[in-house]
Each structure stands twice: as C-alpha cells, then as structure tokens.
C-alpha cells in the first residue's frame, strides 16, 4: 500500500562553490517527496527542505557552521499525501551521500581582479577578496579569511602584442609585477589550493587589459 | 603513485621534428602546471617552457621561442613537446616535471627524461 | 631574466665533511628559491623548497638558507650518496631559471 511506488534517492552529490553547498540527488519524483537530514560524524542528525518535491537542498547554513568538519547527509523517500508510511522495514526508503569536508573540497569560484596600478615599470594588481557565507562574530568571512595562507592566486600576465603568459603567485590577494614600459599587459588570475589533490583550482578570472577602465597609470 | 614518463626522443636531422610525450599517472594533470627543462650532454639544466592545461597558457625561453610548442590532452593526461626545425644545440635529454603552483615549491616531481640527438 | 649565479661550480669534499654551495640571484626573488641534486643519468630530486624547507623525505643533514639575494645549501656531514651535482632554481619569476650546478666529487 503505503510506499509501493517510492523509490530511494540515487546519484547524491555535492555541489559547493565558496561554500555555497547543495545537494543533488535524482530521481525526479513521481508520488513521492524527500526530505534531507545532515550530520557531522560525531553528531545528531538535522533535519531540512522536508517533503520536498526538489532534487536539491541547500545545506550551507549547516556546513559553515565548521567548515573543517566532514558531513554526511541522507535523502529519505516518502509517498506524497502520506507521509508517515514507512518501509518495509518500518523505516522510510533513504540513501546516504558521500562524505563531504567543505574546507577540503569546496570548488574555488571564478575570482575577480578588482583592479591594477602601475608605477613606472611596475604594476600592482589586486585580486577581489570574495565574501563566503562563513560567519565569525556575525560577520561573513571571505574567502582569504578562510583559507588563509592555504590560498594563493597564480596571476597570467602578457604583453598586448604576444601570446606567452609569464606568471607570478602571492599568498595575499596582490601581485607587485615588473613591466616594459610603454608596454600594454592583460591579466588573468586563478584561484589554487596546492595542499589539494582535487578541486585545486578555480576557473580563470575574466581577462582584464591595460587601457582599460580598471586600471590607473601613474608615472 | 605520482610518475612523469617522457618518451618520444630519438635521432634527428637539423632542420627535422620530433615530438615528446609526458604521460602523468597518479595524479591529474589539469589541476597542476608541467614544465619541460633539458639538459645538454655534460651540460646545466634549462628550462625550456610551462603549459598549464586547465587554461592552455603557455611560455617559452627565448632560445626555443617558434620552433617549440607545448600542448596537453587532458583526456589522455599527458602533456607534448613539439619540436620543429631542430638544431644542433637542441640535442639533450628533455625532462618533464611537474609545478604544484604552490608559493613555495617549484618543480616536486620529475620524468625520466628521453634524449633528443640532432646530427646530420 | 633573473640569473641564478652558482659557486662553486665544482669542489672535492670527503665523507664526514660539512659542504656549502651558494647562489646569487641577479635582483630579488623573495625565498622563490630551490635546490635539486642530480645523479648521473638521473633527473633531478628536489632537496629544498622556498629557501630553506626540507622537502619530505630528504635526509636532515641538508639545509637551505637566505641572506637577502644569496642562498646557500648546506650538508652538514657528507655521505656516500651525497656526491651528485647539485643546482638552484628561482621560481619568484618567469622563465624560472637555474644556477650552472655545483659538482661534488670524492677527494
């Protein structure tokens, strides 16, 4: 009767970017909705987006709690209109996630450069330092406060009129880089965690060029 | 086990190409940067140019700069050396190593290198 | 192009002995600097990453320091297995470049 035709969440992923954390899972219900509960190893299971027709939940109100701890969240199944039906088993279908340690292995976002100077021969280029939904204090930490020195940016920068990109890296948020003179240079930057062995890099930040509107000269 | 295995090396005339291969296992290529650096028989180690693969940027040292090319198939996890109208002096063992684009650690782990001879 | 200059380039040294090798960086390169030994026929093994750190697995008796643009290598006692060449690297800057190499040899 109850829960003939509930079928258990499969392919549960973690999709997180600058700790912005969703779980996805399949399939699209038919008569039947979910409800999500996330943990910590050691800790009581939590519930969220109950009896939802959704294939996602948004869990990032619950990692930035401890960034550093590793969670497991489940996906249980119910009939739609009846909910309380259990399993066979008494229990309700449900299916674990695989674990998840968001400080280890959310995806870094696209950064920005927020803009570039140059003195002379040299230009300083400084990186957007983006804010995270990680709270200390009741302020949201960004992503450099989170990371800290595990962080660093790998700038590629070229001449205008050539393709080779040198590069350069910081473990803060600016670059000081020598120049030609009277030379124009395009900047790119990318997000790395070396200590990583997956998700070590973000995407390229949008291509940004001198004489352009971001940039000041001063001689 | 991380491991770089260069092959492709061999015997050339001046003026003729050749192609090197790096094929990486235990660990990603697209996540790191992979340098080539050669080494003249009885000579220094030179670094000869970067690829990184996740975007295709690429430098080269003035001394091979439009004769050599570096490329990388992500799919196949192995970077290449294009080496057209090759001289004498680019005869050498080519290594390939890898860059954990980290702040402080430069090139963490090395190929086995293969030598390229250019003679007539 | 930052030049890594090398000294020496070559030295006679017997087991037990403390050996220094040093390099000179044309303009500064912060601690962006390396030390690799090379056996014959073999490819280079990193010793020494941003000046001074040990990299993981190499014996304690070597160490790295800096002195504004000079570095130095040391090996506190010399073993067998230390006689290789030895060279540094600057990677603050593209091209990273590489000092002449400092040769080892048994006295």
């Known amino acids: 009767s109850g829960t003939t035709n509930t079928v258990a969440a499969y392919n549960l992923t973690w999709k997180s970017t600058n700790f912005k954390t969703i779980l996805e899972w399949e399939p699209k219900p038919v008569n039947q909705v979910y409800t999500v509960q996330i943990s910590t190893k050691s800790g009581d299971w939590k519930s969220k987006c109950f009896y939802t027709t959704d294939t996602e939940c948004d869990l990032t109100d619950e990692i930035v709690k401890d960034v550093k701890q590793t969670y497991l969240a489940r996906v249980f199944s119910y009939p739609a209109g009846n909910v309380e039906s259990t399993g066979s088993a008494g229990e309700p279908l449900y299916e674990n996630s695989p674990e998840f340690t968001p400080y280890l292995e959310t995806n870094l976002g696209q950064p920005t450069i927020q803009s570039f100077e140059q003195v002379g021969t040299k230009v300083n280029v400084t990186v957007e330092d983006e804010r995270t939904l990680v709270r200390r204090n009741n302020t949201f930490l960004s992503l450099r406060d989170v990371f800290g020195k595990d962080l660093i940016y790998t700038l590629y920068y070229w001449k205008s009129s050539s393709s080779g990109k040198k590069t350069a890296k910081t473990n803060t948020n600016e670059f000081l880089i020598d120049v030609d003179k009277g030379e124009n240079y395009c900047f790119s930057v990318q997000a790395v965690i070396p200590s990583r062995t997956v998700n070590r890099k973000s995407t390229d930040s949008p291509v940004e060029c001198m004489g352009q509107e971001k940039g000041e000269f001063r001689e | 086990e991380v491991q770089l295995v260069e092959s492709g090396g061999g015997l050339v005339q001046p003026g003729g190409s050749l192609r090197l291969s790096c094929a990486a296992s235990?660990?990603?290529?697209?996540?790191?940067?992979i340098h080539w650096v050669r080494q003249a028989p009885g000579k220094g180690l030179e670094w000869v140019g970067y690829?990184?693969?996740?975007?295709?940027?690429?430098y080269y040292a003035d001394s091979v700069k439009g004769r050599l090319t570096i490329s990388a198939d992500t799919s196949k996890n192995t970077a290449y050396l294009q080496m057209n109208s090759l001289r004498a002096e680019d005869t050498a063992v080519y290594y390939c190593?890898?860059?954990?684009?980290?702040?402080?650690?430069?090139?963490?782990?090395w190929g086995q290198g293969t030598l390229v001879t250019v003679s007539s | 192009d930052i030049q890594m200059t090398q000294s020496p380039s070559s030295l006679s040294a017997s087991v037990g002995d403390r050996v220094t090798i040093t390099c000179r960086a044309s303009q500064d390169v912060n601690t962006a600097v390396a030390w690799y030994q090379q056996k014959p026929g073999k490819a280079p093994k990193l010793l020494i990453y941003s000046a001074s750190f040990l990299y993981s697995g190499v014996p304690s008796r070597f160490s790295g320091s800096r002195s504004g643009t000079d570095f130095t290598l040391t090996i506190s006692s010399l073993q067998p297995e230390d006689f290789a060449t030895y060279y540094c690297q600057q990677h603050y800057t593209t091209p990273p470049t590489f000092g002449q190499g400092t040769k080892v040899e048994i006295k």
């Open positions: 190593a890898r860059d954990p684009q980290s702040i402080s650690s430069p090139f963490d782990y």
């Open positions: 690829i990184d693969p996740s975007n295709g940027y690429t």
């Open positions: 235990g660990f990603t290529i697209s996540i790191y940067t």
